[in-house]
C-alpha cells in the first residue's frame, strides 16, 4: 500500500481467483483514543471499532472510502483504490491501446518545435468517474523539472457503437535550450483513476523524436506563362523554432485530386517554393519536416489548383 | 590550438556540403548497425546516451546562433560564446567566436575518428565478421576535417592488448553512432546557419 495523495491510498493486488489479497491497517487521524467506529462509503454498517482498523483487501468491494467517526462526528477519511496485477502485468483497462507507433502505446506525445513544450494525449471509452493526474521530468535518477497542466477532455468521437474520449495535457520543460543535444529522455507519468481502480501509464522520449511541425503557412500560387506549371510558395509555420537557418525544414509538395488513388505530381524541396503541374479539380498540398532529424511530417496545408 | 587559415572559396559555403555528407553517412551507418545488430540493444530506446566529447569540447555552446544567446537556458553555467558571421574558413574576417565554434567541431570529429578507427580494428578481429565501419563514413569525417583546415596534434590511436569483447564492442558502436548522429545534426544546423549568415 502507498499514498497517492493526502488520504488516498493505492493497494497493489495480485489478481487471480482465490487470491489471498492484502492485509491493510487503517489509522484514524485523530488524537482521540476511545469510542471510534469505522464505516465504508455510504453504508452505516459499523465495520469495527478502535483507532485502527485491519481489513483484508481482495476485491473492489473491499475498496472505497473508509471513514472513522466518534459520536456521529466524522474524524477522518481514507480512500482505498486498487491497482491490479494479472500474470505479473499491471492492468491497463482504463486507456485504449493506440497501437501507433507500436503496440502497447497508451500515451502519445508531440512537440511543434524545440522549445521544450509538448502535448500528450490518450484515449478512453470511459465517460464518467474518471480522473487523471500528470507528472513529468527530464531523466529519472536526477530528475530535472517539467511542468504539466491539468489533463482536459480535448475531443469526443463516435467509433462504431462506442464513444471514444480523447484527453490531452500540455507540459513545458522548465529550462529548455532549443539547440541542446538531449542525452536524458523526458519521462511522462499519468495516474488514472476510474471509480476505485487505479492505473498508471508512462512514456519516455526525446523531444527530437516527437517533433511534428505545424503545416506551412500562407500557400500562394503563381501560374507560369505558356505552361501548365505553377509556382507554389509558402512560409515556415509561426510555431517553428528560430532562427530558421539553424532549425531548417524540408518540404514535400504534392498535387492530387480528391481521391488518394488518383495520379499525382510530387516533389521534395528545401526551399519555400516549387514548380508543379496543376490539374483541374486537384489541389496543391505542402507539408514540412525537420531537415536534419527525420521525425514526423506536419499535416498538409492545401490550396485548390484552380 | 591554431586559428583557422583563410582559404578563399568561390561559390557555396565549403563546409555545408561536407556536413550534409557527414550526416547522411552516419545515418546510413546507424541504420545498417540497427539492421545487422538486430539482436543487440541498438535502438535509441535501448542504449545509454553517452557523449564522448562531454567536458572536452563545447560545440553546442560555442556554435550557438546569435538569436539563442538571449535564452538563459542556453547560457547556463558557460561562457557566452556564439557565432557572429563568416563562412567556413573562407573569410579573413573570421571572428574569434567563429574560430572557436569551428575548432570545436574539428575536435569532435577528431575524437570520433579515433574512436571509430580503434573500434573498427577490433571489429576486424571478430571471427563472426558481423559488422564493420563504413569506409565512406570515415572518409567523409576526414573530408570535413580537411575542409575545416585546422592544424592540431594528432591523437594516437588507442591500442588494447587484451582480447576484445566483441559483444561490448558492438554495443559501444551503437552508443557511439547514436551520439555521433546527434552531433552531426548539430554540425549540419551550424553549417546551414553560417551559410545563411
Amino acid at each position: 500500500i502507498w499514498e497517492l495523495k493526502k488520504d488516498v491510498y493505492v493497494v497493489e493486488l495480485d489478481w487471480y481467483p482465490d487470491a489471498p489479497g492484502e492485509m491493510v491497517v487503517l489509522t484514524c487521524d485523530t488524537p482521540e483514543e476511545d469510542g471510534i467506529t469505522w464505516t465504508l462509503d455510504q453504508s452505516s454498517e459499523v465495520l469495527g471499532s478502535g483507532k485502527t482498523l485491519t481489513i483484508q483487501v481482495k476485491e473492489f468491494g473491499d475498496a472505497g472510502q473508509y471513514t472513522c467517526h466518534k459520536g456521529g462526528e466524522v474524524l477522518s477519511h481514507s480512500l482505498l483504490l486498487l491497482h491490479k496485477k494479472e500474470d505479473g502485468i499491471w492492468s491497463t483497462d482504463i486507456l485504449k491501446d493506440q497501437k501507433e507507433p507500436k503496440n502497447k502505446t497508451f500515451l502519445r506525445c508531440e512537440a511543434k518545435n524545440y522549445s521544450g513544450r509538448f502535448t500528450c494525449w490518450w484515449l478512453t471509452t470511459i465517460s464518467t468517474d474518471l480522473t487523471f493526474s500528470v507528472k513529468s521530468s527530464r531523466g529519472s535518477s536526477d530528475p530535472q523539472g517539467v511542468t504539466c497542466g491539468a489533463a482536459t477532455l480535448s475531443a469526443e468521437r463516435v467509433r462504431g457503437d462506442n464513444k471514444e474520449y480523447e484527453y490531452s495535457v500540455e507540459c513545458q520543460e522548465d529550462s529548455a535550450c532549443p539547440a541542446a543535444e538531449e542525452s536524458l529522455p523526458i519521462e511522462v507519468m499519468v495516474d488514472a483513476v476510474h471509480k476505485l481502480k487505479y492505473e498508471n501509464y508512462t512514456s519516455s522520449f526525446f523531444i527530437r523524436d516527437i517533433i511534428k511541425p505545424d503545416p506551412p503557412k500562407n500557400l500562394q500560387l503563381k501560374p507560369l506563362k505558356n505552361s501548365r506549371q505553377v509556382e507554389v510558395s509558402w512560409e515556415y509555420p509561426d510555431t517553428w523554432s528560430t532562427p530558421h537557418s539553424y532549425f531548417s525544414l524540408t518540404f514535400c509538395v504534392q498535387v492530387q485530386g480528391k481521391s488518394k488513388r488518383e495520379k499525382k505530381d510530387r516533389v521534395f524541396t528545401d526551399k519555400t517554393s516549387a514548380t508543379v503541374i496543376c490539374r483541374k479539380n486537384a489541389s496543391i498540398s505542402v507539408r514540412a519536416q525537420d531537415r536534419y532529424y527525420s521525425s514526423s511530417w506536419s499535416e498538409w496545408a492545401s490550396v485548390p489548383c484552380s | 590550438r591554431n586559428l583557422p587559415v583563410a582559404t578563399p572559396d568561390p561559390g557555396m559555403f565549403p563546409c555545408l556540403h561536407h556536413s550534409q555528407n557527414l550526416l547522411r553517412a552516419v545515418s546510413n551507418m546507424l541504420q545498417k548497425a540497427r539492421q545487422t545488430l538486430e539482436f543487440y540493444p541498438c535502438t535509441s530506446e535501448e542504449i545509454d546516451h553517452e557523449d564522448i566529447t562531454k567536458d572536452k569540447t563545447s560545440t553546442v555552446e560555442a556554435c550557438l546562433p546569435l538569436e539563442l544567446t538571449k535564452n538563459e537556458s542556453c547560457l547556463n553555467s558557460r561562457e557566452t560564446s556564439f557565432i557572429t558571421n563568416g563562412s567556413c574558413l573562407a573569410s579573413r574576417k573570421t571572428s574569434f567566436m567563429m574560430a572557436l565554434c569551428l575548432s570545436s567541431i574539428y575536435e569532435d570529429l577528431k575524437m570520433y575518428q579515433v574512436e571509430f578507427k580503434t573500434m573498427n580494428a577490433k571489429l576486424l578481429m571478430d571471427p563472426k565478421r558481423q559488422i564493420f565501419l563504413d569506409q565512406n563514413m570515415l572518409a567523409v569525417i576526414d573530408e570535413l576535417m580537411q575542409a575545416l583546415n585546422f592544424n592540431s596534434e594528432t591523437v594516437p590511436q588507442k591500442s588494447s592488448l587484451e582480447e576484445p569483447d566483441f559483444y561490448k564492442t558492438k554495443i559501444k558502436l551503437c552508443i557511439l553512432l547514436h551520439a555521433f548522429r546527434i552531433r552531426a545534426v548539430t554540425i549540419d544546423r551550424v553549417m546551414s546557419y553560417l551559410n545563411a549568415s
Partner: antibody
Framework: QVQLVQSGAEVKKPGSSVKVSCKAS????????LHWSRQAPGQGLEWMGW????????EYAPKFQGRVTITADESTSTAYMELSSLRSEDTAVYYC???????????WGQGTLVTVSS | DIVMTQSPLSLPVTPGEPASISCRAS??????LHWYQQKPGQQPRLLIA???QSISGVPSRFSGSGSGTDFTLTISSLQPEDFATYYC?????????FGQGTKVEIK
Amino acid sequence: QVQLVQSGAEVKKPGSSVKVSCKASGGTFSDYYLHWSRQAPGQGLEWMGWIDPENGDTEYAPKFQGRVTITADESTSTAYMELSSLRSEDTAVYYCARNKELRYFDVWGQGTLVTVSS
Amino acid sequence: DIVMTQSPLSLPVTPGEPASISCRASQSISINLHWYQQKPGQQPRLLIAFASQSISGVPSRFSGSGSGTDFTLTISSLQPEDFATYYCQQSNSFPLTFGQGTKVEIK
C-alpha cells in the same frame, strides 16, 4: 498485371516522320501519366515528354519541342508518339512508360527500334 | 537543364561482394532522384524512388541514399542477375534527365 505493349520496329528516311504506339492493359488508362523516352544504340536514356490521357495535357523536353507530338486515345487505351523531321541521330529504341506519379516511371514498354537511314 | 553525372561508368565486381554507384546532380535536387536497372535488350526497371524509398518486388539488397547533390545506389551482395546497367534520374524539374549509366560487370 499492368502492361505496355509497343508497336514494331520501323525504318525511316531522313526528313520523314514516325508514329510509335503504346497500348496499355491492366488498370484504367486515364489513371496514369504516360511518358516517352529514347535510348540511342549503346547510349543512355533521354526523356522526351509526357501526356495526361485524362485531359490531353502534354509537356515536352525543350530539345524535342516542335518536333514531337504525344497523343492518347482513351477508347483504345493507346498512346502515340510522333517524331517529325527525322535525322540519323534519331535512331534509337523508343520507350513508353507510365506511373500514377508524374515524374518517374514504374512500368515500361518493351521498346520500339526506329532506324533512320537513307 | 539539370545534368546528372554517374560514376564509375564501369564497375567490375565479384559476385557476392557489395557494389556502390554514385550519382551527382549539377544543382541541389533534394531527394528527387530515382534509380533504374536495365539488362541488355530489355526495358528499364524501377529499383528505388525518391533517393531511398524501396519499391515492392525489388530485393532488399538494393538500397539508396543521399540528398541534395550526392546520391548512392548500394547493392549489398551482388547476385548473378544483378549484372546490368544502372541509371539515376532526377525529378526535381522538367526536363527530366538521366545519368549516363553505370555498367556493373563480373570481375
